[in-house]
Amino acid sequence: MKVLQEPTCVSDYMSISTCEWKMNGPTNCSTELRLLYQLVFLLSEAHTCIPENNGGAGCVCHLLMDDVVSADNYTLDLWAGQQLLWKGSFKPSEHVKPRAPGNLTVHTNVSDTLLLTWSNPYPPDNYLYNHLTYAVNIWSENDPADFRIYNVTYLEPSLRIAASTLKSGISYRARVRAWAQCYNTTWSEWSPSTKWHNSYREPFEQHHHHHHHHHHH
């Protein structure tokens, strides 16, 4: 039994780091392997992660951690019974993948403006709480070409857009993801998408002129 692709890990900079690797053949990860992890200089015993299968030869392990400190460095040991298959280290602050934002809501009660809000996935005492920026993806269910990304570079988890920038009378979906420049993170996963019907109506005067013009034809 050998490791084909060495473990690579990402941290949510809060309580979980996820490590993935591939073996050289089909493996029952949870019964055959153990990933031991320990903070450098920690005087307690190493913690054990029981991996799960991630495809035939792939394994994934979710390492439970305490609040991350930027200098934290973990030793990682991958064991198959009494055989040490791989030894490495992992510094969570250098491999951050933020948690996905949640509770994405589209407020359509203001006739000419769409307000999208979502929740910051971190508690206020976490360092990333005040360092996330977002990308909002809006797309039409009817037209695959109608696909747009809005970059939200301010801290407030919200986005206002004019309803008139979207086509009227059709359904749209939106989703949001996050990243933090301070730790040069990867993007988070996308949030679950939310759907709404864009029922924007042009102002009365535009409607009136439009109909009048149409009538003459």
């Epitope: 903070l39 200089f41 920690l42 005087l43 307690s44 015993e45 951690m65 305490d66 609040d67 400190v69 930027s70 200098a71 005492d125």
Partner: antibody, heavy 119, light 108 residues
Framework: EVQLVESGGGLVQPGGSLRLSCAAS????????MSWVRQAPGKGLVLVAT????????SYPDSVKGRFTISRDNAKNTLYLQMNSLRAEDTAVYYC????????????WGQGTLVTVSS | DIQMTQSPSSLSASVGDRVTITCRTS??????LAWYQQKPGKAPKFLIY???TLAEGVPSRFSGSGSGTDFTLTISSLQPEDFATYYC??????????FGQGTKVEIK
């Protein structure tokens, strides 16, 4: 309930020896790092020895290095501190403490045992 | 070794007061800092770790902040049982971890 109970303190002459014990209960002793911390009368806290969970790694400050030895018997759930060549400045209350699961802060402490070095 | 400087060494305060104790380190320790409370004749009690995370069972009137070299312990509304001596301790790097000299919080 986590409990740490120190014993073995007392009066000893300068140059003498003493062995302190700390009986642990209420947790899986063999999976925790442990330490001895002392406090001289009216003074602050000083870390004097640390040991990892299996006893394979120990550490001491220069002030006690070569004179003090920390050890543990995981089968007996007991931590020890062997103190040799004692000096008057070693007079203090000695606490045993457990290291917190995720960090090297000390989450549980014993009630302490007084060591007096005097002629 | 990393030096720890606590201030003030003592302070007088009344029940209900907001109390702030600071701890400064001689080099960057990131957030590897703990706070303890000790009452006369008793063992120290674990209050805070990672500079800001409350230990289990510690009242929310206690809070910690800071990172790098400057740290603060705050008691938002001092209670009668809070009169004690408070110590900071760093746990950065190899186990030569040191404590601050302590801050005694007395009744005014």
């Amino acid at each position: 309930e986590v409990q740490l109970v120190e014993s073995g303190g007392g009066l000893v002459q300068p140059g003498g020896s003493l062995r302190l014990s700390c009986a642990a209960s209420g947790f899986t002793f063999s999976t925790y790092g442990m330490s001895w911390v002392r406090q001289a009368p009216g003074k602050g806290l000083v870390l004097v020895a640390t040991i990892n969970s299996n006893g394979g790694s120990t550490s001491y400050p220069d002030s006690v290095k070569g004179r003090f030895t920390i050890s543990r018997d995981n089968a007996k759930n007991t931590l020890y501190l062997q103190m040799n060549s004692l000096r008057a400045e070693d007079t203090a209350v000695y606490y045993c403490a457990r290291f917190f699961r995720f960090r090297n802060a000390m989450d549980y402490w014993g009630q302490g045992t007084l060591v007096t070095v005097s002629s | 070794d990393i030096q720890m400087t606590q201030s003030p060494s003592s302070l007088s305060a009344s029940v209900g007061d907001r109390v702030t104790i600071t701890c400064r380190t001689s080099e960057n320790i990131y957030s590897y800092l703990a706070w303890y409370q000790q009452k006369p004749g008793k063992a120290p009690k674990f209050l805070i770790y990672n500079a800001k995370t409350l230990a289990e069972g510690v009242p929310s009137r206690f809070s910690g902040s800071g990172s790098g070299t400057d740290f603060t312990l705050t008691i938002s509304s001092l209670q009668p049982e809070d009169f004690a001596t408070y110590y900071c301790q760093h746990y950065y790097g190899p186990p030569t971890w040191t404590f601050g000299q302590g801050t005694k919080v007395e009744i005014k």
